[in-house]
């Protein structure tokens, strides 16, 4: 039975040309978290985090996604085209899979504030 | 089009290391990993490690830790692996190959390097 | 680890059958799977990846299926290139591991 849930940061913006960073939080669950798969809003592969082996970055995403911190994702030198759904996928055990929706805005305003509160979607 | 050239066959006797050369062309040599994975002559095939060219950082198979050594030159797209304590059961074609995009896969191969082992 | 039991070992088969190669993994891998081909002397070449992907240039009579612990590779009609040994690979953990192979020979 599946008991746990995905906390994300929910709806957040960022300055173009700025980094954000990407986070999801499983928690309510004793699962030990095998791999971590993140994607972009047309389900393009971002990266993945495996336990045994580390971090994949996609290569077109090399110069601009970090990995980190922990199980999250930063993301670097924001375009509008960066605008858009983000998903995390958790693969765990024994539970199985669990998914987290992260929406980003990338605004053009040297003002725009950068919010990121842990919510449940 | 992406290509992978190994280095020529080598004949090492027991004890000895060996250093095998792959050079990479037609893609961006840092974004992707370099992967080593040896075939015993009319044997399977079998991951040894795997490097990451844009960082440096390696990852190995528990039985070739201590064995096998990775490192990249990025200047000249050319990813090296080095075997030491060489024994006979280490007598194997050795094989590069170019990471997958979307995970810990082997799109592109080398051409192979057979290295022998023997006294 | 993760240990990866192909089967059969080998088949005979004529040009134009319909060949399916079986693979399974001791756990689950999601569909973090991915099939080679061998020809003698040769370096393996990617066929599959994601359990059903197919990477540029690679024919469409190849195609693969399944999720989880259990895998299929097809050839819909034998070509007289597709005679060959044919790998699956994990990759979901380290370390990562390939099946033992499957001799397609010529019947």
């Known amino acids: 039975m599946m008991t746990g849930t995905i906390e994300t940061t929910g709806n957040i913006s960022a300055k173009k040309g700025g980094s954000v960073i990407l986070q999801c939080h499983l928690s309510s669950t004793m699962a030990q978290v095998t791999q971590v798969n993140w994607e972009q809003h047309d389900h393009s592969l971002l990266a993945i985090r495996n336990a045994e082996l580390g971090w994949h970055i996609y290569p077109a995403f090399k110069d601009r996604v970090a990995p980190g911190p922990g199980l999250g994702l930063t993301l670097q030198s924001l375009t509008m085209n960066d605008t858009g759904e983000y998903f995390c996928t958790y693969h765990t055990y024994p539970d199985g899979t669990y998914r987290g929706r992260i929406f980003l805005e990338v605004l053009e305003s040297s003002v725009a504030e950068h919010s990121a509160r842990f919510q449940i979607p | 089009q992406v290509q992978l050239v190994q280095s020529g066959a080598e004949v090492k006797k027991p004890g000895a290391s060996v250093k095998v050369s792959c050079k990479a062309s037609?893609?961006?040599?840092?974004?992707?990993?370099m992967y080593w994975v040896r075939q015993a002559p009319g044997q399977g095939l079998e991951w040894i490690a795997f490097?990451?060219?844009?960082?440096?950082?390696?990852t190995y198979a528990q039985k070739f830790q201590g064995k096998a050594t990775l490192t990249v030159d990025t200047s000249i797209s050319t990813a090296y692996m080095e075997l030491s304590r060489l024994r006979s059961d280490d007598t194997a074609v050795y094989y590069c190959?170019?990471?997958?995009?979307?995970?810990?896969?082997?799109?592109?191969w080398g051409q192979g390097t057979l290295v022998t082992v023997s006294s | 680890d993760i240990q990866m039991t192909q089967s059969p070992s080998s088949l005979s088969a004529s040009v134009g059958d319909r060949v399916t190669i079986t693979c399974r993994a001791s756990q689950s891998i999601y569909s973090y799977l991915s099939w080679y081909q061998q020809k003698p002397g040769k370096a393996p070449k990617l066929l599959i990846y994601n359990a059903k992907s197919l990477p540029s240039g690679v024919p469409s009579r190849f195609s693969g299926s399944g999720s989880g612990t259990d895998f299929t590779l097809t050839i819909s009609s034998l070509q007289p290139e597709d005679f060959a040994t044919y790998y699956c690979?994990?990759?979901?953990?380290?370390?990562?591991?390939f099946g033992q192979g499957t001799k397609v020979e010529i019947k």
């Open positions: 190959a170019r990471g997958g995009d979307y995970g810990w896969y082997l799109g592109v």
């Open positions: 037609g893609y961006t040599f840092t974004r992707y990993s």
């Open positions: 690979q994990h990759h979901y953990g380290n370390p990562l591991t």
């Open positions: 490097i990451d060219a844009y960082s440096g950082g390696s």
